[in-house]
């Protein structure tokens, strides 16, 4: 339900190919904004409601997901041990 849209390509400088990418997501009934495989996605609203963040599969394939204390977010642990933490405000 999400597509990557390229915005703001600088056409005044032909050598410059930097562009800003953004996701455009159309969620179905019962879904709201979330993260799947480290990208914007529409996810079951109940996941967000219950703060079971790992159920939306927010980490990249091969990474392990763990809930932070008080379900304030999640961590993604890479096979090499590096940990990326995401907190939800």
């Amino acid at each position: 339900t999400c597509e990557i849209v390229t915005l703001d390509r600088d056409s005044s400088q032909p050598r410059r190919t930097i562009a800003r990418q953004t996701a455009r997501c159309a969620c179905r009934k019962g879904q709201i904004a979330g993260t799947t495989r480290a990208r914007p996605a529409c996810v079951d609203a109940r996941i967000i409601k219950t703060k079971q963040w790992c159920d939306m599969l927010p980490c990249l394939e091969g990474e392990g997901c763990d809930l932070l204390i008080n379900r304030s977010g999640w961590t993604c642990t890479q096979p090499g041990g590096r940990i990326k933490t995401t907190t939800v405000s």
């Epitope: 953004t22 996701a23 455009r24 997501c25 159309a26 969620c27 179905r28 009934k29 019962g30 879904q31 709201i32 904004a33 914007p40 529409c42 609203a45 109940r46 409601k49």
Partner: antibody, heavy 129, light 103 residues
């Protein structure tokens, strides 16, 4: 404070048309799914229509499908309901309502009837000859 | 169609419970007093607006939501409607309403 103010009601003739408006303030209108709900005199609440936060999706109750069009102007923070081929059974108070979830930029989100957290005071529509 | 009782009664100070079942996604509860505007007392299953007294609470169990008013007061006498999405998950639906009478 969140405020929803409906207008456009009044006495209408059967077969006629009307356009209801709901002016919103106190929140980021473009981030919320919105609803129209009606109540016939002495009766319960009835789902009429809803629209996604960006206006790309619409939905209608069976009683008005094919006769109603919901729309929104996010620049003016206004919700609309166009009703055609009016019938006596369309008589009632029409409420505008907001779904609580604040949809982030780049997303199109539906509201949820169970997530309605704010209501307007309603505008009365009477369809009679 | 949603199922909710047509009437519930309680004495002041008692606990009143109103159930609603038959929908999907989330449930809300909306209070209506004669001649007054609709007021949301519970939304998204168990969330309470900041201006609603703490005696109002909601709880979801399976596909049934229960509105509980702990320590009912005279001013709680009103009609209460539950709202959710129909079983197909494509359109909104409301219960027929429950009249709460405070004896």
């Amino acid at each position: 404070a969140v405020t929803l103010d409906e207008s456009g009601g009044g006495l209408q003739t059967p077969g006629g048309a009307l356009r209801l408006s709901c002016s919103a303030s106190g929140f980021t209108f473009s981030s919320h799914g919105m609803f129209w709900v009606r109540q016939a005199p002495g009766k319960g609440l009835e789902y009429v229509s809803e629209i996604t936060n960006d206006g790309s999706g619409t939905n209608y109750g069976s009683a008005v499908k094919g006769r109603a069009t919901i729309s929104r102007d996010n620049g003016q923070s206004t919700l609309y309901l166009q009703m055609n081929s009016l019938r006596a059974e369309d008589t009632g108070t029409y409420f505008c309502a907001r779904s609580t979830y604040e949809c982030p930029g780049g997303f199109s989100c539906w509201g949820d009837t169970g997530q309605i957290d704010a209501w307007g005071h309603g505008t009365e529509v009477i369809v009679s000859s | 169609a949603l199922t909710q009782p047509s009437s519930v009664s309680a004495n002041p100070g008692e606990t009143a419970k109103i159930t609603c079942s038959g929908g999907v996604y989330s449930y809300g509860w909306f209070q209506q007093k004669p001649g007054s505007a609709l007021v949301t007392v519970i939304y998204w299953d168990d969330e309470r607006p900041s201006d609603i007294p703490s005696r109002f609470s909601g709880a979801l169990s399976g596909s049934t939501n229960t509105l509980t008013i702990t320590g009912v007061q005279a001013e709680d006498e009103a009609d209460y409607y539950c709202g959710t999405e129909d079983i197909s998950g494509t359109a909104g639906v409301f219960g027929a309403g429950t009249t709460l009478t405070v004896l």
